[in-house]
């Protein structure tokens, strides 16, 4: 008799998930000398242990603590770039501006970027058919809890001037329901972070609006100011400069050092 399996609303675990995580870990530790000590098999075991045999709607941050411990990494706290709804451009920027880091430039962020995973209660199987959707099913699912955990830790580590790249083409430039708006903003440490500087990236060629006056940016400013952190917002009108650099990252036009 085939065993009944829960049908979730979201896509299932990314195919070849264990192999992908392991391969990414090996690649990352080869490229980043400061992480060469990491044992990737142990990392995978800790990752797996966070969600295997557990109900995929009942995952906690505690479940990920062994993984967090193994993936502990020091990035320069004054070189952190957060982002919201503009991941690709943020990643292109840090590919070029090598001394700045997004969460996905760290080991744990790199391992999980663009992947989906979940298990099943009381079985050691990975569910490749479906996983819980954050809205339709539950928020305490393996993927959401992972990103909430690593995002919180990343924001807590930040210091001095923290930059965030925001998408000026969206109706909500700042969305308080995004990971940035719901987690990172609230975990910046006022005793360490002096300023949050938002870069609002314009999409249109002839766009000369001041998107820093957008109501959602005012909302962000209010939240940040109440946390005793200074806020700054800059309009960025030429994102094509980043794209040029992705094609040719060694070029001199791809560094802010003048």
């Amino acid at each position: 008799v085939p065993r009944w399996r829960q049908q979730w609303s979201g896509p299932g675990t990314t195919k070849r998930f264990p192999e992908t995580v392991l391969a990414r870990c090996v690649k990352y530790t080869e490229i980043h000398p400061e992480m060469r000590h990491v044992d990737c098999q142990s990392v995978w075991d800790a990752f797996k242990g966070a969600f295997i045999s557990k109900h995929p709607c009942n995952i906690t941050e505690e479940d990920y603590q062994p993984l967090m411990k193994l993936g502990t990494q020091t990035v320069p706290c004054n070189k952190i770039l957060l982002w919201s709804r503009i991941k690709d451009l943020a990643h292109q920027f840090t590919q070029v501006q090598r001394d700045m880091f997004t969460l996905e430039d760290t080991l744990l962020g790199y391992l999980a970027d663009d992947l989906t995973w979940c298990g099943e209660f009381n079985t050691s199987k990975i569910n490749y058919q479906s996983c819980p959707d954050w809205r339709k099913d539950c928020s305490n699912n393996p993927v959401s809890v992972f990103w909430k955990t690593v995002s919180r830790r990343f924001a807590e580590a930040a210091c001095d001037v923290v930059h965030v790249m925001l998408n000026g083409s969206r109706s909500k430039i700042f969305d308080k329901n995004s990971t940035f708006g719901s987690v990172e903003v609230h975990n910046l440490q006022p005793e360490k972070v002096q300023t949050l500087e938002a870069w609002v990236i314009h999409g249109g060629r002839e766009d000369s609006r001041d998107l820093c006056q957008d109501p959602t940016i005012k909302e962000l400013e209010s939240i940040i100011s109440k946390r005793n952190i200074q806020f700054s917002c800059k309009n960025i009108y030429r994102p094509d400069k980043f794209l040029q650099c992705v094609k040719n990252p060694e070029d001199s036009s791809c560094t802010s050092e003048i």
Partner: antibody, heavy 120, light 107 residues
Framework: QVQLVESGGGLVQPGGSLRLSCAAS????????MNWVRQAPGKGLEWVSY????????NYADSVKGRFTISRDNSKNTLYLQMNSLRAEDTAVYYC?????????????WGQGTLVTVSS | DIELTQPPSVSVAPGQTARISCSGD??????VYWYQQKPGQAPVLVIY???KRPSGIPERFSGSNSGNTATLTISGTQAEDEADYYC??????????FGGGTKLTVL
């Protein structure tokens, strides 16, 4: 080191035309936005025009729109400014200037300038 | 379009601090750049991105930008700092603008 050398300036009558050139060296010319900026005698700086790295996007100050055309030849590392229907108020030193990288939009390097005099 | 307003002239005694202002609506929302120009010479970038100094520019040059005003500060002003100073910003499209310039006199 970065070098920008303008040429093509001179005396021209009102209504006449002139083509300025800017020879670039010491950097990957095809990767940068390039600009023309001018300065009338005893006056301040005025941005004239910019062009993006592949030459597909240009923009002009209102004062020259429809009369001036910026272009570039990346194979020759050269920037151009074609100036038509010249007026007395176009008299100025014309500078070629290279853009700053990434999120910054200013002028990292300037040429020494070429003088354009529009007079009858 | 934003308009940038600078004082026509500023005077300072040698060794003292000179401050040159540049004002415009919501200027804090845009990066500001400062250029130094000596007679008969091309302008030179001294500050970019509000407060960053290009290599080769002395540490006595600094910049800030808040509210509607950006400020270029020259600490311990020297005779060689006597020049015209221009602020500049970019507000998208065809809106690349300079201030009118400030003549700095070192007394």
């Amino acid at each position: 080191q970065v070098q920008l050398v303008e040429s093509g300036g001179g005396l021209v009558q009102p209504g006449g035309s002139l083509r300025l050139s800017c020879a670039a060296s010491g950097f990957t010319f095809s990767s940068y936005y390039m600009n023309w900026v001018r300065q009338a005698p005893g006056k301040g700086l005025e941005w004239v025009s910019y062009i993006n790295p592949n030459g597909m996007m240009t923009n002009y100050a209102d004062s020259v729109k429809g009369r001036f055309t910026i272009s570039r030849d990346n194979s020759k590392n050269t920037l151009y400014l074609q100036m038509n229907s010249l007026r007395a108020e176009d008299t100025a030193v014309y500078y070629c200037a290279r853009d700053l990288p990434l999120v910054y939009t200013g002028f990292a390097y300037w040429g020494q300038g070429t003088l354009v005099t529009v007079s009858s | 379009d934003i308009e940038l307003t600078q004082p026509p002239s500023v005077s300072v005694a040698p060794g003292q601090t000179a401050r040159i202002s540049c004002s415009g609506d919501n200027l804090r929302h845009y990066y500001v750049y400062w250029y130094q120009q000596k007679p008969g010479q091309a302008p030179v970038l001294v500050i970019y991105g509000d407060s960053k100094r290009p290599s080769g520019i002395p540490e006595r040059f600094s910049g800030s930008n808040s509210g509607n005003t950006a400020t270029l500060t020259i600490s311990g002003t020297q005779a060689e700092d006597e020049a015209d100073y221009y602020c500049q910003t970019y507000t998208g499209g065809a809106s690349l603008v300079f201030g009118g310039g400030t003549k700095l006199t070192v007394l």
